[in-house]
């Protein structure tokens, strides 16, 4: 079954015009490792008040959401991927 | 049950504005990403707009790239898409999509799950 | 940008009988074992709708007679058995994280 995770909204702290663009900047998905991507204006959250959120796991920035989430690495899961799996 | 409404389509002349809306309903509106999605007379699917939750983030394909403005007022569950310079090409039925979305492992996989009925927009002379 | 070319651009299938409509795109959909492409049913005078998301993946509440499978650049959607109200447009979407979201160009469905 699909486990919907929770996400963290970061605060706003910016205006609208400041932070729209035209392109996301996640990681492309394709196999170009994003080298046909723009410069990006905006901040990543992940990289200023989010960078110690995922305590074993990396922080990614979903932009439609708006909203932090963690990558846990193996073994680990929870919000900030803090808890380790039994197993 | 959960709604997308859109309205304002019309016939408008090459060069002309348009602003359509989308009354959303049965659903938490600032929890999903919305887009614009028109469908041409010859019945091909093209996106137009997409829009963040909180409406920070706005992206475009190059068609319509600095003519038409999305945005959306989460006080009023409306999604909104500002057309200007109105082209023959731009003729189409337009809806808005809600972006349904999977988030696990740090993956987030989107689709667009309830679309309104359209409104049609009509460029011609 | 990613183009979706689905084919054929259409097809006559017998009541009962499997429906195959093929998407392929122009560089893979794949991240990390992930598809990111969607289908979508479309019939005359209303809008699309979701049938399959994350390629395989079926819209809760729909018959177990749509399937979606694929990965990277080939992606099918199967309709098994067909029935009368399957006929329609359908449609394969690309998700991946970069704009612009394309769609393939469509296969209209006829029931034989």
């Known amino acids: 079954s699909v486990r919907v995770e929770q996400v963290v909204k970061p605060p706003q702290n910016k205006t609208e015009s400041e932070n729209t663009s035209d392109k996301p900047k996640r990681k492309k998905k394709g196999g170009k490792n994003g080298k046909n991507r723009r410069n990006r204006k905006k901040k990543n959250p992940c990289n200023a008040e989010f960078q110690n959120f995922c305590i074993h796991g990396e922080c990614k920035y979903i932009e439609h959401l708006e909203a932090v989430t963690c990558k846990c690495q193996q073994e680990y899961f929870g919000e900030r991927c803090g808890e380790k799996s039994m197993k | 049950e959960v709604q997308l409404q859109e309205s304002g389509g019309g016939l408008v002349k090459p060069g002309g504005s348009l602003k359509l809306s989308c009354a959303a309903s049965g659903f938490t509106f600032n929890s999903y990403a919305m887009s614009w999605v028109r469908q041409t007379p010859e019945k091909r699917l093209e996106w137009v707009a997409t829009?963040?939750?909180?409406?920070?983030?706005?992206y475009y394909p190059d068609s319509v790239k600095g003519r038409f403005t999305i945005s959306r007022d989460n006080a009023k569950n409306t999604l909104y898409l500002q057309m200007s310079s109105l082209r023959s090409e731009d003729t189409a039925m337009y809806y808005c999509a809600r972006h349904g979305y999977l988030l696990y492992d740090g993956y987030y996989e989107w689709y667009f799950d309830v679309w309104g009925a359209g409104t049609t927009v009509t460029v011609s002379s | 940008d990613i183009v979706l070319t689905q084919s054929p651009a259409s097809l006559a299938v017998s009541l009962g009988q499997r429906a195959t409509i093929s998407c392929k795109a122009s560089?893979?959909?794949?991240?990390?074992?992930?598809?990111?492409l969607n289908w979508y049913q479309q019939k005359p005078g209303q809008p699309p709708k979701l049938l399959i998301y994350?390629?395989?993946n079926l819209e809760s509440g729909l018959p177990a007679r749509f399937s979606g499978s694929g990965s990277g650049t080939d992606f099918t959607l199967n309709i098994h058995p067909v029935e009368e109200e399957d006929a329609a447009t359908y449609y394969c979407?690309?998700?991946?994280?970069?704009?612009?979201?394309?769609f393939g160009g469509g296969t209209k469905l006829e029931i034989k």
């Open positions: 560089q893979s959909v794949d991240y990390d074992g992930h598809s990111f």
């Open positions: 994350a390629a395989s």
């Open positions: 979407q690309q998700s991946t994280e970069d704009p612009p979201y394309t």
């Open positions: 829009i963040s939750t909180g409406g920070s983030h706005t």
